[in-house]
Interface confidence: low
């Protein structure tokens, strides 16, 4: 069964900068990735970025740069312009879609005990699965 993993990483040099890494484990060709925060996309979450393998990417503040790392994984750099970062206690969700087989979504967050520069371990939390 396909799975989605999510890692949230705080940058060691800039405590207001975070990077979300997401990947898809399974067969099939990824045709769309949606990253949201505050919950799953379409279920209370706010869209941060959309990545299309052929047509490029779109991102919305506070997302700074969304990019493909491999054919089945992406990264999203976030920058908080405020005095204190709201990202530490935030849930980030990644939805990977494979047309027309379906879509898979998992969420993750930065553990409270995480030191700057250390990434959180993979914490797949399946939200929605294709049947």
């Amino acid at each position: 069964t396909p799975e989605v993993w999510v890692q949230v990483q705080m940058e060691a040099t800039e405590l207001s900068s975070f990077t979300v890494h997401c990947g898809f484990l399974g067969p099939g060709s990824i045709s769309l990735v949606t990253v949201s925060w505050g919950g799953p996309d379409g279920a209370g979450g706010t869209k941060l970025a959309v990545l299309h393998p052929e047509l490029g990417t779109r991102q919305w503040a506070p997302a700074r740069q969304a990019r493909w790392e491999t054919q089945s994984s992406i990264s999203l750099a976030l920058e908080d312009s405020g005095a204190s970062s709201p990202f530490a206690n935030t849930t980030f969700c990644c939805k990977f879609a494979s047309f027309p087989e379906g879509s898979w979504e998992s969420c993750g967050s930065l553990p409270p005990s995480s030191d700057p520069g250390l990434s959180a371990p993979p914490t797949p939390v399946p939200i929605l699965r294709a049947d």
Epitope: S29, G42, H52, E54, A97, D131
Partner: antibody
Framework: EVQLVESGGGLVKPGGSLKLSCAAS????????MSWVRQTPAKRLEWVAT????????YYPDTVKGRFTISRDNAKNTLYLQMRSLRSEDTAMYYC?????????????WGQGTSVTVSS | QIVLTQSPAIMSASPGEKVTMTCSAS?????LYWYQQKPGSSPRLLIY???NLASGVPVRFSGSGSGTSYSLTLSRMEAEDAATYYC?????????FGAGTKLELK
């Protein structure tokens, strides 16, 4: 302005063949996934076929798989649907549909449709 | 395949009245879309990704829901909104549509 103009519909006998065309304009055709959707006389909407923009993958529901073939000619901005072994249940209005870049699973652009009647 | 059941099949509303119609999925759905079709015209995309308004769609339309239960709401009925509304999913192969809700002007 986005325009999708279907043609090629008509009356055909059961077991016959028909090829539908869809001329696209007003958008970058080669970058869009395209589909055919039909509407039965009972007004039910049914997905018929989809072709992706880049690597030309095609998808069909079991009801038409092996009988229908979707294809595209990006140089001519034209979408096609080759229909073979037609059955009475294939009688419908056939719509050409364009899918928006980042929500191309949504059917953003629709043509006016071309009518196909399968009857002896 | 996922079956989408729309209710009611037919409904009527007076101008200014609030209208809500539902789309129930036989299994959990990730993406849901709503279309409007007026007599003699092609369907038109209203809502994508459950709650996002398509370009040019009046703000009186809104979509919501998750899992297997979704709804389309019209905050104030207008004469031009008389049409048939269809929901559609692609979360599971094959793509399927609901049978539609016909909204008439009272």
């Amino acid at each position: 302005e986005v325009q999708l103009v279907e043609s090629g519909g008509g009356l055909v006998k059961p077991g016959g063949s028909l090829k539908l065309s869809c001329a696209a304009s007003g958008f970058t055709f080669s970058s869009y996934a395209m589909s055919w959707v039909r509407q039965t006389p009972a007004k039910r909407l049914e997905w018929v076929a989809t072709i992706t923009s880049g690597d030309i993958r095609t998808y069909y529901p079991d009801t038409v798989k092996g009988r229908f073939t979707i294809s595209r000619d990006n140089a001519k901005n034209t979408l096609y649907l080759q229909m073979r072994s037609l059955r009475s249940e294939d009688t419908a209005m056939y719509y050409c549909v364009g899918h928006d870049d980042f929500h191309f699973y949504a059917m953003d652009y629709w043509g006016q449709g071309t009518s196909v009647t399968v009857s002896s | 395949q996922i079956v989408l059941t729309q209710s009611p099949a037919i409904m009527s509303a007076s101008p200014g009245e609030k209208v809500t119609m539902t789309c129930s999925a036989s299994s959990s759905v990730s993406y849901l879309y709503w279309y409007q079709q007026k007599p003699g015209s092609s369907p038109r995309l209203l809502i994508y990704d459950t709650s996002n308004l398509a370009s040019g769609v009046p703000v009186r339309f809104s979509g919501s829901g998750s899992g297997t239960s979704y709804s389309l709401t019209l905050s104030r009925m207008e004469a031009e909104d008389a049409a048939t509304y269809y929901c559609q999913q692609w979360s599971s192969y094959p793509l399927t549509f609901g049978a539609g809700t016909k909204l008439e002007l009272k």
